[in-house]
């Protein structure tokens, strides 16, 4: 028998520095977690103690903090090289700055293979990107070889900016021939490493002949066997065992997100490359694990540029940006409109001639807007200003919801109106009219939404049975502020870009902004 240790991360999302327990900015260092310096300590410890170790990343290193905003992927290549990752799969967020934003900072600088079997380049891009990412890689481990085959969510064109010269194929269809190729090269131990979410990970384990282990990402799935060490609730045991169509037991793993855990899986193979046993658990990277001093020093060196960036002007406002709780928790506020407009703008994807855009709607809990921005400071808007407005380090995500769920959400928005509670929704691409004289749960008297399948966008009444795409904060997608109906009834959820980054990019693009209060949210009394 031959034993392999797989260490894995996924959806790190730019958390190079240690974070608080909820993966936001570290405040009390003695209780902080994760970060590349701490990760390095644990990886080194395991590499010294065990013979055959692979360190793998299942995508979405890009996007999530000011580190990515400033360094644009150079930080990912640098620190992943320093940690000696053995392979990485491309995630959807690796395309956030377009293909060039992937090629130059990451693909050309990484000294490890970056993988995806289901992304095919065409046109002029094919020769430019050829050989920079690979469908599979054979890794020498000890005196054996292990094949790693990569995959990426085929929804990427809707979630990011891969352009028109990359084709995202069905994962299973694309993976099978590459696995077959590895078999012809006499590689009998094969790991599928990818970024399509836990459901697809399980399907790959079931359907792709020859895959021995699946290491996934995208859905931020936390798996654990036994008592979990922190706040995350396990979605199943680690590893999650799938019985393949040809009768094999295939372990599937994922390690939550944000570098909080290091996935740790031990696999025992027989001489023919069959999995005999698999066991392990994610390792919580808490403060009991010291940060490596040399990596920490490097982080501090790179940090300097971030501090300088946060005080630079992004753009100007010529109007007061009303982000006060007195406004945003009671009525339409122009800060809410600005943020929602930025959210929609960030999701412009012309992927189908029938649609002017794939999504037109935004909702945003008023309680998530934490500060106004005064225009009487020469109109200057900085990252620092925006961090006061959006201090929680969240993301603006894409969900699919039925009209009926949206209706419930808007009823919840005003179910206890007048108490300055955070659930009051700010909107974009939506016109809502409330009648507060009616009883809670029946106060939405008009709800019109902007069409997407149209050449001239206009507002139409919400249809209860129709499925709509909506951009919203991850906080709402996870049922925050009492929006349990969103969490329970969403049909799809894809995590998006860092909230501050979305707004800062929009302001930089617009240069001068002047958002108005324009009648997106109205109140009527009595007969409508």
């Amino acid at each position: 028998a031959w034993e392999l240790t797989i260490l894995h991360t996924n959806d790190v999302h730019s958390r190079l520095e240690q974070t608080s327990e909820d993966s936001s900015k570290c405040v009390n260092a003695s209780r902080c977690m994760g970060g590349v310096a701490r990760l390095f300590t644990k990886v080194q410890q395991i590499r010294r103690a065990e013979p055959n170790v692979l360190l793998l990343d299942a995508g979405d290193q890009y996007q999530g903090t000011i580190w990515f905003t400033v360094y644009k992927g150079a930080e990912v290549a640098h620190f992943m090289n320093a940690l000696r990752y053995d392979a990485m799969a491309l995630g959807n967020h690796e395309f956030d700055n377009g293909v060039e934003g992937l090629i130059e900072p990451l693909l050309k600088e990484a000294k490890f293979p970056i993988l995806s079997a289901n992304i095919k380049a065409k046109g002029p891009l094919a020769s430019q990107i050829s050989g920079l990412y690979l469908p599979y890689k054979v890794l020498p481990v000890g005196d054996e070889v292990v094949g790693i085959v990569g995959y990426t969510s085929k929804e990427t064109p809707f979630l990011s900016n891969p352009g028109t010269n990359l084709v995202f194929e069905d994962e299973i269809t694309a993976l099978q021939p590459e696995v077959d190729k590895l078999k012809t090269l006499n590689v009998n131990k094969i790991i599928a490493l990818g970024h399509s979410g836990f459901e697809m990970d399980k399907l790959i384990a079931q359907k792709v002949r020859g895959v021995d282990v699946v290491v996934g990402g995208h859905s931020n799935t936390f798996l654990y066997t036994g008592n979990p060490p922190s706040k995350e609730v396990p979605a199943g045991k680690y590893p999650f065992i799938v019985t393949s169509d040809d009768g094999r037991k295939v372990p599937v793993v994922q390690a939550y997100a944000f570098g909080k855990y290091l996935g740790y899986l031990k696999i025992e193979f027989d001489e023919r490359g069959n999995v005999i046993s698999s066991h392990g658990n994610p390792i919580l990277l808490n403060s009991s694990i010291p940060e490596d001093p040399s990596i920490k020093a490097d982080i501090n060196k790179w940090r300097i540029k971030l501090d300088n960036y946060s005080t630079q002007e992004l753009g100007k406002t010529i109007v007061y940006l009303d982000g006060s709780s007195q406004s945003c928790r009671f009525r339409e506020c122009n800060m809410g409109n600005l943020i929602c407009d930025a959210m929609i703008n960030n999701n412009l994807r012309h992927t189908d001639e029938m649609f002017w855009n794939h999504v037109s709607m935004c909702i945003l809990n008023g309680g998530g807007i934490r500060s106004p921005i005064d225009e009487r400071n020469n109109g200057t808007i900085t990252w620092e200003n925006l961090a006061a407005v959006l201090p929680f380090g969240g993301t603006f995500d894409l969900v699919q919801l039925k009209g009926s769920t949206l209706k419930k959400a808007f009823e919840h928005s005003v179910h206890r109106y007048g108490q300055s509670t955070g659930e009051f929704l700010q909107v974009g691409g939506i016109h809502v009219v409330y009648d507060l004289s009616r009883k809670p749960g029946d106060r939405v008297v008009k709800l019109d939404v902007l069409c997407t399948k149209c050449r001239v966008p206009s507002y139409d009444p919400l249809k209860m049975d129709e499925v709509y795409k909506v951009i919203l904060p991850n906080f709402l997608a996870n049922g925050g502020d009492g929006f349990q109906m969103i969490k329970d009834e969403l049909l799809r959820h894809d995590s998006g870009d860092q909230d501050i980054n979305v707004v800062s990019t929009y302001i930089s693009k617009m240069k001068v902004i002047y958002p108005a209060v324009e009648g997106r949210i109205k109140f009527s009394t009595g007969s409508h």
Partner: antibody, heavy 121, light 107 residues
Framework: EVQLVESGGALVQPGRSLRLSCAAS????????MHWVRQAPGKGLEWVSG????????GYADSVKGRFTISRDNAKNSLYLQMNSLRAEDTALYYC??????????????WGQGILVTVSS | EIVLTQSPGTLSLSPGERATLSCRAS???????LAWYQQKPGQAPRLLIY???SRATGIPDRFSGSGSGTDFTLTISRLEPEDFAVYYC????????FGPGTKVDIK
């Protein structure tokens, strides 16, 4: 500038041993996997062996498996090839080559000038 | 094991002419793992093309690579005097395989 300088080549009798060295400079040695590639007189190129940055992964061509051993000393920026049970068909110019990756291999982006090993009685 | 064959064995051309070199694999291979090297007499090989079509750093744009599956091509659009050399294709699967080489000499 990347420099790879091979040494240790000699004329040896069949069945004897020889150790080749490669001194690397101009780059961070332990950032890359390294290889030995050989070329018999007037013939093509043949990959001999490769080693990852930390010696955690090692590979050999079937023709040398069990006879040759690759190793590296990152502190000395050096790559080695211990060649035992040498045969006449091992006669070749031996090149030291640097890979693009550190823990796996893909291609040779820098080469030394080569060192001649002649196996003859 | 994948076997690479190169044709022609020798290509005799004049400076300024176009050179087309062929490399054929015994079975279908991914273009991501196909590279081309140039070797001048008495010198070490030099990486020209990787991923079948991407030029290595510092390689002039008169060199281009193409192909997929089993058939790959290296093209030198206008031969310069310094291009007369032996060209090898290489594949990486679980180990390395080189083709036997094509010699481009002066007509």
């Amino acid at each position: 500038e990347v420099q790879l300088v091979e040494s240790g080549g000699a004329l040896v009798q069949p069945g004897r041993s020889l150790r080749l060295s490669c001194a690397a400079s101009g780059f961070t040695f332990d950032d890359y996997a390294m290889h030995w590639v050989r070329q018999a007189p007037g013939k093509g190129l043949e990959w001999v062996s490769g080693i990852t940055w930390n010696s955690g992964g090692i590979g050999y061509a079937d023709s040398v498996k069990g006879r040759f051993t690759i190793s590296r000393d990152n502190a000395k920026n050096s790559l080695y090839l211990q060649m035992n049970s040498l045969r006449a068909e091992d006669t070749a110019l031996y090149y030291c080559a640097k890979d693009r990756y550190y823990s796996s291999w893909l291609l040779f982006d820098n080469w030394g000038q080569g060192i001649l090993v002649t196996v003859s009685s | 094991e994948i076997v690479l064959t190169q044709s022609p064995g020798t290509l005799s051309l004049s400076p300024g002419e176009r050179a087309t070199l062929s490399c054929r694999a015994s079975q279908s291979v991914s273009s991501s793992y196909l590279a081309w090297y140039q070797q001048k007499p008495g010198q070490a090989p030099r990486l020209l093309i990787y991923g079948a079509s991407s030029r290595a750093t510092g390689i002039p744009d008169r060199f281009s690579g193409s192909g997929s599956g089993t058939d790959f091509t290296l093209t030198i659009s206008r031969l310069e005097p310094e291009d007369f050399a032996v060209y090898y294709c290489q594949h990486y699967g679980s180990s390395f395989t080189f083709g036997p080489g094509t010699k481009v000499d002066i007509k």
